[in-house]
Amino acid sequence: FPQDRPFEDTCHGNPSHYYDKAVRRCCYRCPMGLFPTQQCPQRPTDCRKQCEPDYYLDEADRCTACVTCSRDDLVEKTPCAWNSSRVCECRPGMFCSTSAVNSCARCFFHSVCPAGMIVKFPGTAQKNTVCEPASPGVSPACASPENCKEPSSGTIPQAKPTPVSPATSSASTMPVRGGTRLAQEAASKLTRAPDSPSSVGRPSSDPGLSPTQPCPEGSGDCRKQCEPDYYLDEAGRCTACVSCSRDDLVEKTPCAWNSSRTCECRPGMICATSATNSCARCVPYPICAAETVTKPQDMAEKDTTFEAPPLGTQPDCNPTPENGEAPASTSPTQSLLVDSQASKTLPIPTSAPVALSSTGKPVLDAG
């Protein structure tokens, strides 16, 4: 009935409303400078200030600049919206040691577990890696009898520890001296390591071997079944696939039932020391000479104890490979040595924090 329809031009003469033909109802007219948050606003709260691009409307109704993720060590987690800032987080392979509003003030590379130890929890954008001793032949989850009754989610398949050259384990986040603690937020819960329930609670002389599966009816496929992250080698042994979890490595080919995962140096790096299915030592490309730091009084001594070099002693480059090659089992404290006449020298101690410079190259942060 025509008389039931609002008078289109004035909505019963109310100047603060207008008639929207598309939705066939009266809508609230947003005051000058404010914009509707929906197609047909009904009340003043449905109107808002319009901010410039890359600005958002904060709780106090002010247009505030969205944070920028333009630093090399940051990536965008959530975009800039009308009512919320862009959120940045540390890029993969790094964690936030000093948080900032909607961003991170300082990102450090994840720690690399020292040779012989295993990853308990891999690093995330918020948390660093946590390592622990390996558990030879016995599930690490059985700390009390009740823990051995059923699989626990934190168990990592055990194999002989592979020496890892921590040439890039420049990421341990505790300065060697001075005791400067990183913000405690750099250490609450991490994501769990991959489960491997079938290795729990039973010692195994063949790490990574699952109980042999019965042959499927009419099938000749009766091969030995290995645990996740293990492969069947030529000798018919279950062998741990190499891990590409080091910050300077990326996965080239995945871990398959009959072949190991293969790793290669991440873009911008070249392999200085090769290793089976991986690279023991990646160096930035192009290579530039690195300064090294040693305590002068220790120069003549064999048993040098390393200290974090003072701020400003580390150039924006990584060490050159020593004569191009180094043994894959280089010990953590010696893996970064530069070929020189001096006694032990350590450009980037494994326990000095390493951040990224504005050029994206690792730089030492002495705390």
Epitope: G116, P133, A187, K189, D303
Partner: antibody, heavy 123, light 107 residues
């Protein structure tokens, strides 16, 4: 500052169950990477690691005592507990709880120790 | 279990001397070794971790070295307050194990 303090019964008879409590302050066991271990030391002898509890309630223990050991924690009250069943005179020792620090997350050593509580097992 | 052997139960020294305490692992533990100092009636205190890194606040006369199976703690200029027992610890694999200790005494 970080402090840890052990408490226990002092004296037990063989076959009884030992219950120890480690009360700590200055850190939280909810922080990732953090953990607390129990370590014992018979008088005039070396140190023996017994068990460890991680921030996420994951536990590890010494296989030589595993069947008798239970480690647990109460994060909100900043306490870690150790139970050893069927004690024997060989369990006579000073029992320490010690913290594995979170910020040395790629190492496994103990930066702060309690003063220890002495247990004597005697019939 | 990995056995950590500290062959010398006692070592005699004088103030100002340089002394080296040794520790041998029964198998390769890479550099996953810590050293502690324990004074009579006290609990152990960390000195060195990862075989050669000095723990925060530890005087620089304490140095650690070694990797694989042989480790050394060296005190370059022994002070009277250094007279204590020294323990090595491996954390390469569970169970974590300690050496039997070496007591540093005055000559």
């Amino acid at each position: 500052q970080v402090t840890l303090k052990e408490s226990g019964p002092g004296i037990l008879q063989p076959s009884q169950t030992l219950s120890l409590t480690c009360s700590f302050s200055g850190f939280s066991l909810s922080v990732s990477g953090m953990g607390v271990s129990w370590i014992r030391q018979p008088s005039g002898k070396g140190l023996e690691w017994l068990a460890h509890i991680h921030w996420d309630d994951d536990r590890r223990s010494n296989p030589s005592l595993r069947s008798r050991l239970t480690i647990s924690k109460d994060t909100s009250n900043n306490q870690v507990f150790l139970k050893i069943t069927s004690v024997d005179t060989a369990d006579t020792a000073t029992y320490y709880c010690a913290r594995r620090p979170d910020l040395y997350g790629n190492y496994f050593f103990f930066d702060f120790w309690g003063q220890g509580t002495t247990l004597t097992v005697s019939s | 279990d990995i056995v950590m052997t500290q062959s010398q139960k006692f070592m005699s020294t004088s103030v100002g001397d340089r002394v080296s305490v040794t520790c041998k692992a029964s198998q390769n533990v890479f550099t996953n070794v810590a050293w502690y100092q324990q004074k009579l009636g006290q609990s152990p205190k960390p000195l060195i971790y990862s075989a050669s890194y000095r723990y925060s606040g530890v005087p620089d006369r304490f140095t650690g070295s070694g990797s694989g199976t042989d480790f050394t703690l060296t005190i370059s200029d022994v002070q009277s307050e250094d007279l204590a027992e020294y323990f090595c610890q491996q954390y390469n694999s569970y169970p974590v194990t300690f050496g039997a200790g070496t007591k540093l005494e005055l000559k």
